[in-house]
Interface confidence: medium
């Protein structure tokens, strides 16, 4: 299978890491979201409603 | 010139803690780790975990988890390694490397850069 | 955690000669694999990183290829120099240390007959 960290999916220099069923980002500081898209805003709060149980804004996610 | 120099080997003593350090100079951080790998004696490699230096993050070898802890002191340019609950097991060549993670926008994760390595013998 | 098992663990070659060792990796490691010359008491070198792409100042006679889970490094000609142990790396998705983690081949031994 193609490498699905080849097209870059991590937004704002996000990590990405390639496993065998998908990927990963790892998302630089001030960044969440499944792809690093949403900023997390100075106050804490982030662009997103919340962010899913158990993971911190930055937290690498699915 | 790039440069990785660990430093803190020598003799600790079974159920103690090791703690080496890593100086490194010579290139910027943004799209580097550091690495700490380690060689028995007679063996092979054994990988322990990094630092995603730009990222502050730390990650672990399932193996050591719990064990281990890789700190940054970036305005030193220095990255140290805790190993507790030590063993003779625990005898090797403890060395840093430089991890490329992303070069150009590829992510590579080579070990680039290596420290001539520093001797750890537990022993009573 | 993956496993990378090299093969064969060690190997004898005539000067000039070409030399092949083998890499396999547990699960899909996709291209992310890294090749490692080290001679007795030194550090260990970078060769090889992402499959196939030589480190800077390797000579060209060391290349890499595969994917996946099978992965090959070639001498061409074998020279003096190149006795050495070495190791492949790969780095890998691991839910286990936190999304990033590397394992080596337990490598190697590569002599001149």
């Known amino acids: 299978r193609a490498d699905p960290c080849a097209a870059r999916p991590c937004a704002h220099g996000g990590r990405c890491y390639a496993h065998f069923s998908g990927l990963v980002c790892a998302c630089a500081p001030g960044y969440m979201g499944a792809r690093c898209e949403f900023p997390v805003h100075p106050d804490g709060a982030s662009a997103l409603p919340a962010a899913p149980p158990g993971l911190r804004p930055g937290d690498p996610q699915r | 010139e790039v440069q990785l120099v660990e430093s803190g080997g020598g003799l600790v003593q079974p159920g103690g803690s090791l703690r080496l350090s890593c100086a490194a100079s010579?290139?910027?951080?943004?799209?580097?780790?550091v690495s700490w790998v380690r060689q028995a004696p007679g063996q092979g490699l054994e990988w322990m975990g990094y630092?995603?230096?730009?990222?502050?993050?730390?990650y672990y070898a399932s193996w050591v988890t719990g064990r281990i802890t890789i700190n940054p002191d970036t305005s030193k340019n220095q990255f140290s390694l805790q190993l507790n609950s030590v063993t003779p097991e625990d005898t090797a060549v403890y060395y840093c490397?430089?991890?490329?993670?992303?070069?150009?926008?590829?992510?590579?994760?080579?070990?680039?850069?290596w420290g001539q390595g520093t001797l750890v013998t537990v022993s009573s | 955690d993956i496993v990378m098992t090299q093969s064969p663990d060690s190997l004898a070659v005539s000067l000039g000669e070409r030399a092949t060792i083998n890499c396999q990796a547990s699960?899909?490691?996709?291209?992310?694999l890294s090749w490692y010359q080290q001679k007795p008491g030194k550090a260990p070198k970078l060769l090889i990183y992402?499959?196939?792409t030589l480190a800077s100042g390797v000579p060209d006679r060391f290349s890499g290829s595969g994917s996946g889970t099978d992965f090959t490094l070639k001498i061409s000609r074998v020279e003096a120099e190149d006795v050495g142990v070495y190791y492949c790396?790969?780095?890998?998705?691991?839910?286990?240390?936190?999304?990033?983690?590397?394992?080596f081949g337990q490598g190697t031994k590569v002599e001149i007959k």
């Open positions: 490397a430089r991890v490329a993670l992303v070069v150009a926008g590829v992510a590579y994760y080579g070990m680039d850069v």
């Open positions: 010579g290139f910027t951080f943004s799209n580097y780790g």
């Open positions: 630092i995603d230096i730009a990222f502050g993050r730390t």
């Open positions: 699960q899909n490691i996709y291209s992310y």
């Open positions: 992402r499959t196939s």
């Open positions: 790396q790969s780095y890998y998705y691991s839910s286990g240390s936190s999304y990033g983690a590397f394992a």
